[in-house]
């Protein structure tokens, strides 16, 4: 009862966490405008891992995807990586523990079956996890080297006339949603490797003991016992691998220069 | 059409509080801010503040401690409120909707007050 | 706050000659988000409201004549009427959309010759 509860809340909270790690890499909100200590503008610039957006107090928004490749930092395409490699392993983590939950019969699919199905994708919710929170602290690390940078010549004056006020980038949303969301990956991950000890099937058998009483000829035959030890020699771990995601942007738009965080 | 109506009081006493209301159609304010702004006769506008669709606002930091804008998205009316009036403060009195690169897009046809005892 | 100076103050033409009027502004206005700059150029004749004819310093308010073209950018902004009219007799201001307070220059009155 205990495994089976320990692997459907692995299984919600994965799914939970995928779902974060989804909402984040999709979000704009990866860098928002730092508006302390900084003159007020009627404008709010923020950043995404795929465009970058501009409000106006008027409340007309616009947004322009970041239409290169090559253009972009290489921080930048490393973090997209890492989150895509994130969900793909995390939506294969979710199918194949959809086979494995206990509370589902597929055919006459043994324990041991489950038990493997589990402890995959434990293990791939485990690494999606720290993909997302990877992705996010390379993100957030880029941005507070910048911050400081930025604040160094916060205004670069021209000819000693005119000053050219630079925007300045700090945490948005998405940071914390994509930490947290990895963290709850990470979690379910932990709870689904638990899981599978549980649903491990005993193998060991203890030989049936011939006992000799005096005087009579009666035999103890004790049933075949199983023991906890573990996993079975028949236990096989199966690997699987990310064939490699790629994302392109297909909507063309103006070209734009994207002062990127 | 977008269409801004200014209604208020021509005339006001020194240390007096004016009133003006800027009724608007053609439009919502729950999706457009509106602005205020004056006119000195024979001189240059100038931006008192701003209340925006979501409901906040901004102020001139010069005129802040007596400057109030509200708004009735029901009744689609918008009120600016100055306290302690100088002669200094006789100017026109315009409301205009917000647009594009936050221009002032329509303009009321403006409210002129005379600060006068 | 951001000044607005424009220039000159007042210019005395003849109707179809080609206009150009400065504004400069104490800081950029350009938004490095979207490159854009928030500079926005009103036409007010007496005794009416302003009328707005340029925001994001060259993009044209729809039903404004394409005589009236406004270029610039960052600090220095320029309106230009190709051929002036005589009802394009007024005072131009342009203003800051940028840096709260929203700013306007003192103007440049047109008249005519």
């Known amino acids: 009862m205990a495994v089976t509860a320990c692997q459907g809340l692995g299984f919600v909270v994965s799914l939970i966490g995928i779902a974060g790690i989804i909402a984040a890499t999709c979000m704009d909100q990866w860098s928002t405008q730092d508006l302390y200590n900084n003159p007020v503008t009627a404008v709010f610039n923020y950043q995404g891992l795929w465009r970058s957006c501009v409000r106006e107090s008027s409340g007309f928004t616009e947004c322009r995807g970041y239409f290169t490749l090559l253009g972009l930092p290489a921080m930048l395409q490393a973090v997209r990586a890492l989150m895509i490699v994130g969900i793909v392993l995390g939506a294969i983590g979710l199918l194949v523990s959809i086979f494995a939950l206990k509370c589902i019969r597929i055919g006459s699919m043994e324990d041991s079956a489950k038990a493997n199905m589990t402890l995959t994708s434990g293990i791939m919710f485990i690494v999606s996890g720290l993909c997302a929170i990877a992705g996010v602290s390379v993100f957030a690390n880029m941005l507070v080297t910048n911050f400081w940078m930025s604040t160094a010549n916060m205004y670069t004056g021209m000819g000693g006339m005119v000053q050219t006020v630079q925007t300045r980038y700090t945490f948005g949303a998405a940071l914390f949603v994509g930490w947290v969301a990895g963290g709850l990956t990470l979690i379910g991950g932990v709870m689904m490797c638990i899981a599978c000890r549980g649903l491990a099937p005993e193998e060991t058998n203890y030989k049936a003991v011939s006992y000799h009483a005096s005087g009579h000829s009666v035999a103890y035959k004790p049933g075949g016992f199983k023991a906890s030890t573990g996993f079975g020699s028949n236990t096989k771990n199966k690997k699987i691998y990310d064939g490699g995601a790629r994302t392109e942007d297909e909507v063309q738009s103006y070209p734009s220069k994207h002062d990127y965080v | 059409q977008v269409q801004l109506q200014q209604s208020g009081p021509g005339l006001v006493a020194p240390s007096q509080s004016l009133s003006i209301t800027c009724t608007v159609s053609g439009f919502s304010l729950t999706n457009y801010g509106v602005s205020w702004i004056r006119q000195p006769p024979g001189k240059g506008l100038e931006w008192l503040g701003a209340i925006w669709a979501g409901g906040n606002t901004n102020y001139n930091s010069a005129l802040m401690s007596r400057l109030s804008i509200r708004k009735d998205n029901s009744k689609s009316q918008v009120f600016l409120k100055m306290n302690s009036l100088q002669t200094d403060d006789t100017a026109m009195y315009y409301c205009?909707?917000?647009?594009?690169?936050?221009?002032?897009?329509?303009w009321g046809q403006g409210t002129l007050v005379t600060v006068s005892a | 706050d951001i000044v607005m100076t424009q220039s000159p103050s007042s210019l005395t033409v003849t109707a179809g000659e080609k206009v150009t009027m400065s504004c400069k502004s104490s800081?950029?206005?350009?938004?490095?988000?979207?490159?854009?700059?928030?500079l926005t150029w009103y036409q007010q004749k007496p005794g009416r409201p302003p009328k707005l004819l340029i925001y994001w310093a060259s993009t044209r308010e729809s039903g404004v004549p394409d005589r009236f073209t406004g270029s610039g950018s960052g600090t220095d902004f320029t309106l230009t009427i190709s051929s002036v009219q005589a009802e394009d007799l007024a005072v131009y201001y342009c203003?800051?959309?940028?840096?709260?307070?929203?700013?306007f220059g003192a103007g440049t009155k047109l008249e005519l010759k």
């Open positions: 205009a909707r917000v647009g594009y690169g936050n221009s002032f897009a329509n």
């Open positions: 203003q800051n959309n940028y840096f709260y307070p929203l700013t």
């Open positions: 800081q950029s206005l350009l938004n490095s988000g979207n490159l854009r700059n928030y």
